[in-house]
């Protein structure tokens, strides 16, 4: 008995020839013995079956002794053994369908689950194996599982379900929902305009949900809400904002954030986090803000940086063309009786620069001049 | 056992919409044909159509034009609508269950039947 | 459609008596045929599927025979209770179609 194997909504083909290269008459049946089709001279004849709007053959094909069943949108339950009689002859074919669904949804917050189900008809024992987009291969039989889904793993997965020594093969896309990147850090002088921005993974159609950014200033013993906004059909609002500071954000997507200028009080991180329609779950971005300032005050010349720097972050001062006079792994550092002249002040991180400022030093005399 | 029960009004105006509905009991409607069947008085069986519990019809070529069948798997009921009638259809209408099984296919369950007379 | 045509379209016979229907199909039908019985105010009730085939629970005085076009109807004795209209019906094809009835009566 030959064996076919169909995939659940996809069109099926069982061949079915006759040695007479002629238009015969020809039946097929399923394995009730109930007609599905046949022909009545040149015309196609259905029966009662189940399959009757779904089935159908090709009579171009008839006059070469050819007399294929072709079944439209497989379901599982067209699983059957299907007998074509043709010139006192039985031709017996066993289709299998088969369907490969994802869970709930094909698309999955970044950390979630995925889990692939396979439907299989009774009496059947099919393997799977997936191939993520990343290629990583996943084997199971009838259900699949991928725990915390990773950015990488959107795209086509393909999977492959085996029975009887055939194959059929499925594509499932998988779209995981999350921003670009999971977190950042913007440096920035003091006074200086601030832009966050959470640009987002993916594409839809409507991006409908809601979001908050909650900022831990370093100064501060608690955090507190920024603002907090509202996304409709990829169109943002914002539904409420701090007084200080006083946040602009962009209309449109990406998800902007204008902070008017750096001050060390806002000095910290946030995290933003999106709750989508229809999604359980949030996605999260983290932002950092670094700032630095540089003052002279009488005889002592002081750079400090605020905000989440790391231990390896080397603040430096120097003058202008010359070696550093002070460089150190701290968050501030200072010259006392600073010579004459542009002094700048340096954040960097193995040689390169994240962070400039410059402060001129006058002679004795006179007062310092910051550009 | 499964029963079937006809529902609708016993008369119908000329020109108007036969409606009628079925009320499957003690059995699911699931994975099934559901059909009407009717018969004039002293006359023979006319299959009008079937339809499936997903909602797929065949209907009679020689009534298609003037027939909706539909189902409500909530309700256990499936309903016929025949539009534009005349004298020719009064008759009794049934409703019945289509089954399949090794070398059957035919009506295994039928409701009681209800006159439909169709008079101004 | 596949036009089923039954005859006679009434007979009276005795009880006891041996009763024969026919039923013919405009085009090959193979074996897809039923006959059903139906009695004054009633729904009709399967007798025969397959052309041949006994529904279960349904006297053995009943029978069928024939394929293709042709097919037979038997009551090998007649009895009271089998005064009813019977129906031959044709699942080759949709539309599912019907014989026009025979009428069985008592002498």
């Known amino acids: 008995k030959k064996v076919v194997l169909g995939k659940k909504g996809d069109t099926v083909e069982l061949t079915c020839t006759a040695s007479q290269k002629k238009s015969i008459q020809f039946h097929w049946k399923n394995s009730n013995q109930i007609k599905i089709l046949g022909n009545q001279g040149s015309f196609l004849t259905k029966g009662p079956s189940k399959l009757n709007d779904r089935a159908d053959s090709r009579r171009s094909l008839w006059d070469q002794g050819n007399f294929p069943l072709i079944i439209k949108n497989l379901k599982i339950e067209d699983s059957d053994t299907y007998i074509c009689e043709v010139e006192d002859q039985k031709e017996e074919v066993q289709l299998l369908v088969f369907g490969l669904t994802a869970n709930s949804d094909t698309h999955l917050l970044q950390g979630q689950s995925l889990t692939l189900t396979l439907e299989s008809p009774p009496g059947s024992s099919p393997s799977v194996q997936c191939r993520s987009p990343r290629g990583k291969n996943i084997q199971g039989g009838k259900t699949l599982s991928v725990s915390q889904l990773e950015l990488q793993d959107s795209g086509t997965w393909t999977c492959t379900v085996l029975q009887n020594q055939k194959k059929v093969e499925f594509k499932i896309d998988i779209v995981v929902l999350a921003f670009q990147k999971a977190s950042s850090i913007v440096y920035k002088k003091e006074g200086e305009q601030v832009e966050f921005s959470f640009p987002l993974a993916f594409t839809v159609e409507k991006l409908t949900g809601s979001g908050e950014l909650w900022w831990q200033a370093e100064r501060a013993s608690s955090s507190k809400s920024w603002i907090t906004f509202d996304l409709k059909n990829k169109e943002v609002s914002v539904k409420r904002v701090t007084q200080d500071p006083k946040l602009q954000m962009g209309k449109k997507l990406p998800l902007h954030l204008t902070l008017p200028q750096a001050l060390p009080q806002y000095a910290g991180s946030g995290n933003l986090t999106l709750a989508l329609e229809a999604k359980t779950g949030k996605l999260h971005q983290e932002v950092n803000l670094v700032v630095m300032r540089a003052t002279q005050l009488q005889k002592n010349l002081t750079c400090e940086v605020w905000g989440p720097t790391s231990p390896k972050l080397m603040l430096s001062l120097k003058l202008e063309n010359k070696e550093a006079k002070v460089s150190k792994r701290e968050k501030a550092v200072w010259v006392l009786n600073p010579e004459a002249g542009m002094w700048q002040c340096l954040l960097s991180d193995s040689g390169q620069v994240l962070l400039e400022s410059n402060i001129k030093v006058l002679p004795t005399w006179s007062t310092p001049v910051q550009p | 056992q499964v029963q079937l029960q006809e529902s609708g009004p016993g008369l119908v105006k000329p020109s108007e919409t036969l409606s009628l509905t079925c009320t499957v009991s003690?059995?699911?409607?699931?994975?099934?044909?559901w059909s009407w069947i009717r018969q004039p008085a002293g006359k023979g069986l006319e299959w009008i159509g079937r339809i499936y519990t997903s909602g797929s019809t065949n209907y009679n070529p020689s009534l298609k034009s003037r027939i909706t069948m539909s189902v409500d798997t909530s309700k256990n009921q499936f309903s016929l609508e025949l539009s534009s009638v005349t004298a020719a259809d009064t008759a009794v209408y049934y409703c019945?269950?289509?089954?399949?099984?090794?070398?059957?296919?035919?009506?295994?369950?039928w409701g009681q039947g209800t006159t439909v007379t169709v008079s101004s | 459609d596949i036009q089923m045509t039954q005859s006679p379209s009434s007979l009276s016979a005795s009880v006891g008596d041996r009763v024969t229907i026919t039923c013919q199909a405009s085009q090959d039908i193979s074996n897809y045929l039923n006959w059903y019985q139906q009695k004054p105010g009633k729904a009709p009730k399967l007798l025969i599927y397959?052309?041949?085939n006994l529904e279960t629970g349904v006297p053995s005085r009943f029978s069928g025979s024939g394929s293709g076009t042709d097919f037979t109807f038997t009551i090998s004795s007649l009895q009271p209770e089998d005064i009813a209209t019977y129906y031959c019906q044709q699942y080759d094809s949709l539309p599912l179609t019907f014989g026009g009835g025979t009428k069985v009566e008592i002498k």
């Open positions: 019945a269950r289509e089954l399949e099984r090794y070398y059957f296919y035919g009506v295994d369950v």
């Open positions: 397959a052309a041949s």
């Open positions: 003690n059995g699911s409607i699931s994975d099934y044909y």
